[in-house]
């Protein structure tokens, strides 16, 4: 099996983690696709997935997790607003092709949350953003049953992550609606 | 085959303002995040904004913010980019593109010059 | 900002052999890596994203490489038309940056 590294971001609550998951597009345009938690001896967990087949640009959101599969570009983007400590974790994107085992990425994400102020709700000091508005959208899609194996051997997309942080108009939408969903059972 | 047209530039005086448009074909306009890149004369290649769909997520690139915004019309598929209290180093060519992080379509850029 | 550094600046080659681009970063971008092509009054053109995924249409003698700070750009067989500037280019975080250019010319 491939050895998995992971990337460390240490965020406070408040911030986004904004997560750009790149994969061939020709290959996998349309799979479905998955963001994933992976807890100490557990197999990971699917905490939200794009349609089936995936839509292109149409976000899909899930508690605070807002999922952006961008077909033209070969990229899903995953965001989780308003991060809380208990979001702390070990994160990633997959991709479902039953009847084969979902490929997953090389380059988890290791999520910290600290507490502290973060200026306004998703934002910091280091922003080039000036306009950021949480979608409305409550499209929501059924995932898979099953759970991906812990074993590597292939891994198309590759993942990054970054502070989301507007600096001068913020919109939250729905914001209440929003935080008010645990991302975990 | 994706299209990326634009035009409005020229030569302009410092402090002045000039309008870049982008008219966009090809592909679902819509659907794609957009943005500017600049090119000074005989330089590299410079990031200036991207755009969400929905405009909902606007960036700038720290040297602009506050004198260009970046717009744009799905109804009319076209990009624009209003440039005020332009300065000698945004003299470049601007190309129009499609995508917000990596770019995978180019106009073929329009020149701005800025001088007295 | 992360800063993009590439190396060299100016790499002399002949046609038929390969060459190998450096591209630095100053902090850790993962694999949110792009390379583009730009010939002489053109337009840049997408090579290669995910550090590693060669955009549609990119002949397969382009190959892309690394990830967290250190990257390769491969072309295994110089042709004619491959003698141009490229840059690589992070989008990991804002605001987005190129690199500062490799220029391939004929040796």
């Known amino acids: 099996a491939t050895k998995l590294t992971e990337e460390k971001y240490e965020l406070k609550e408040g911030q986004t983690l904004d997560v750009k998951c790149d994969y061939t597009l020709e290959k996998f345009a349309s799979s479905q696709k998955a963001w994933q938690i992976i807890r100490d001896g557990e197999m990971p967990k699917t905490l939200a997935c794009t349609e089936r087949p995936s839509k292109n640009s149409h976000p899909v959101q899930v508690g605070r997790i807002i999922l952006e599969d961008y077909h033209d570009h070969g990229l899903l983007r995953v965001r989780m607003v308003n991060l809380q400590v208990e979001d702390s974790g070990l994160y990633q994107c997959v991709i479902y092709q039953p009847p084969k085992e979902p490929h997953m990425l090389f380059d988890r994400i290791r999520l910290v949350v600290t507490k502290g102020f973060s200026g306004t709700p998703g934002s910091n000091e280091n922003s080039t953003q000036n306009v950021y508005k949480i979608p409305p959208t409550t499209t929501k899609a059924l995932c898979p049953l099953y759970t991906s194996p812990r074993t590597v051997t292939q891994a198309p997309p590759k993942s990054t992550a970054d502070v989301s942080t507007p600096d001068s108009e913020i919109n939250l939408t729905n914001v209440t609606d929003i935080i008010r969903v645990p991302v975990f059972n | 085959e994706v299209q990326l047209v634009e035009s409005g530039g020229g030569l302009v005086q410092p402090g002045g303002s000039l309008r870049l448009s982008c008219a966009a074909s090809?592909?679902?306009?819509?659907?794609?995040?957009m943005s500017w890149v600049r090119q000074a004369p005989g330089k590299g290649l410079d990031w200036v904004a991207s755009?969400?769909?929905?405009?909902?997520?606007?960036y700038y690139v720290e040297s602009v913010k506050g004198r260009f915004t970046i717009s744009r019309d799905n109804a009319k598929n076209s990009l624009h980019l209003q440039m005020n209290s332009l300065r000698a180093e945004d003299t470049a060519v601007y190309y129009c593109?499609?995508?917000?992080?990596?770019?995978?379509?180019w106009g073929q850029g329009t020149l701005v010059t800025v001088s007295s | 900002e992360i800063v993009m550094t590439q190396s060299p600046a100016t790499l002399s080659v002949s046609p038929g052999e390969r060459a190998t681009l450096s591209c630095r970063a100053s902090q850790s971008v993962s694999s949110n890596l792009a390379w583009y092509q730009q010939k002489p009054g053109q337009a840049p053109r997408l090579l290669i994203y995910?550090?590693?995924i060669r955009a549609t249409g990119i002949p397969a003698r382009f190959s892309g490489s690394g990830s967290g700070t250190e990257f390769t750009l491969t072309i295994s067989s110089l042709q004619s038309e491959d003698f141009a500037v490229y840059y690589c280019?992070?989008?990991?975080?804002?605001?987005?940056?190129f690199g500062g250019g490799t220029k391939v010319e004929i040796k």
């Open positions: 995910g550090a590693s």
């Open positions: 755009i969400k769909q929905d405009a909902s997520e606007i």
């Open positions: 280019q992070q989008y990991k975080n804002w605001p987005l940056t």
């Open positions: 593109v499609r995508g917000g992080w990596r770019f995978e379509s």
């Open positions: 090809g592909f679902t306009f819509s659907s794609n995040w």
